[in-house]
Every structure is written in structure tokens, then in C-alpha cells.
């Protein structure tokens, strides 16, 4: 069975400053990723950063960086200020689009006893929804 | 809840121009569909694909406002446009606005997929 694990690290030289790594554990060929804070996209959250394996890549403040890491992970950096930077509680969620297997999505926040710029290594974070 | 609210509809002559405008708002959170689409509805008729465009710019136009109307997306990625130039006749009908994503990313043929709709603006060319 497919499934995603999500990493959220805060950068020890900026407090303001996150960054959040996805990856997909399966078999298919990933055809879209979405990354979001607050909640899945187009339910409670707002999509940070869409990306495309072909297509390119789309970004909305306060993501500063997104990229592709491998064919099936990915990295965001966030850093903002006020109102539209994240805080220590936000949830980040990554979707996962892949042929044949669907869509998968998973999200975190960081761990509540971390220090900036320490985290848990990657695990699979538990699956919310398999369309 | 996702709400979608379209805004540029009137009266205009044969030849004329129109700017439709389409905001996707939510509350408590930012939608950026995937994709945002017009239809449009002529009295009498079914409805009908006008325009699509993704998130990533990719436009799609029924053969009908080749050439004629323009899809565009604010950097924002929740506000569509459809600037109508040399509008004719049979462009007479009400226009509406649709949100929804996809597995690629892409608009869906025809509209499929599309889950949020907006109440619709009229537009007739008349002179």
C-alpha cells in the first residue's frame, strides 16, 4: 500500500523560517504533489505550492522555495512574518497524485519538544485520505 | 465552504467587448483550484464549455471564442477572467464560473470534476 511521510523542521538561524519535506512511497509515477497549511487542500487548507514533474512549479507566499528533492519527494521552505508566517502548531499537508495507484495524502507539524533546527527523521505520516 | 461569485456581465453591442470577472473565496482558508472554467447558457440551450484554465496557465477554449475570448488567472491562483472581444449574437447567454481540481493538475474535459459553481452573470450583445 502507498503512503506519504511528511517532515516539518524549523530553521535554527531564522525562527520564522520552516521547511517541510514530503515523500511518496510507491510503486506509480507521480503526476501532480500539493502541499498545503492548515488542513488538506480545498478543505479547511490553503494550498502553499503545487508541483508538476513536467510542468513546473507554483508557489504562493510566504512558500520562498519549493523544489523537487527526488522523482517522489519534495521540499518546501516557508518564512514569512505576521500574520502570514506559521507557527509551531500549523499543520502541513503534501498530496500525493500517482498513476495507477491514485491519490494519496498525509500531513504534520512540528514535533511539540523539537529545538530549532532538529527534527524526527522522516517517517510515514498516518494516511488521511486515499481518493 | 467554497463560494464562487462572478461580477462583468451587461449589455453590449455587436463587436463590443467584456471583461467577466470570478472570485473562489472560502471561509477561514484560501482555495486555489486547480482548475477555473466558463460556461455559458443561451435560453432554450444546454450549457456549454467556454474556457478553462489550470493552475499552471494552461488555457483550453471551445472552437466557438477562438481568437475572440481570453482566460486569465490572477498570480494569486482564486481570481479567473474572460475578456470577451467582438462579441456577437449568439455569445448572448448567462456565464458562469466553475472551480474543482484533478488528479494532473489539468482542466477536465468538459467540465468534469468541476464541484463548485458560481450563480451565473448574464451577458447579451444586442444592439
Known amino acids: 500500500t502507498p503512503e506519504v511521510w511528511v517532515q516539518v523542521r524549523m530553521e535554527a538561524t531564522e525562527l520564522s523560517s520552516f521547511t517541510i519535506r514530503c515523500g511518496f512511497l510507491g510503486s506509480g509515477s507521480i503526476s501532480l504533489v500539493t502541499v498545503s497549511w492548515g488542513g488538506p487542500n480545498g478543505a479547511g487548507g490553503t494550498t502553499l505550492a503545487v508541483l508538476h514533474p513536467e510542468r513546473g512549479i507554483r508557489q504562493w507566499a510566504p512558500a520562498r522555495q519549493a523544489r523537487w528533492e527526488t522523482q517522489s519527494s519534495i521540499s518546501l521552505i516557508l518564512e514569512g512574518s505576521g500574520a502570514s508566517s506559521p507557527c509551531a502548531n500549523t499543520t502541513f499537508c503534501c498530496k500525493f497524485a500517482s498513476f495507477p495507484e491514485g491519490s494519496w495524502e498525509a500531513c504534520g507539524s512540528l514535533p511539540p519538544s523539537s529545538d530549532p533546527g532538529l527534527s524526527a527523521p522522516p517517517t510515514p505520516a498516518p494516511i488521511l485520505r486515499a481518493d | 465552504e467554497v463560494q464562487l461569485v462572478e461580477s462583468g456581465g451587461g449589455l453590449v453591442q455587436p463587436g463590443g467587448s467584456l471583461r467577466l470577472s470570478c472570485v473562489a473565496s472560502?471561509?477561514?482558508?484560501?482555495?486555489?483550484?486547480?482548475?477555473m472554467a466558463w460556461f455559458r447558457q443561451a435560453p432554450g440551450k444546454e450549457r456549454e464549455a467556454v474556457a478553462g484554465i489550470d493552475i499552471f496557465g494552461g488555457t483550453t477554449y471551445a472552437d466557438s471564442v477562438k481568437g475572440r475570448f481570453t482566460a486569465s488567472r490572477d498570480n494569486a491562483g482564486f481570481s479567473l477572467y474572460l475578456q470577451m472581444n467582438s462579441l456577437r449574437a449568439e455569445d448572448t447567454a448567462v456565464y458562469y464560473c466553475?472551480?474543482?481540481?484533478?488528479?494532473?493538475?489539468?482542466?477536465?474535459?468538459?467540465?468534469?470534476?468541476?464541484?463548485?459553481w458560481g450563480q451565473g452573470t448574464m451577458v447579451t450583445v444586442s444592439s
Open positions: 466553475a472551480a474543482g481540481d484533478s488528479p494532473d493538475g489539468r482542466c477536465p474535459p468538459l467540465g468534469q470534476g468541476l464541484n463548485y
Open positions: 472560502a471561509s477561514g482558508f484560501t482555495y486555489r483550484p486547480y482548475c
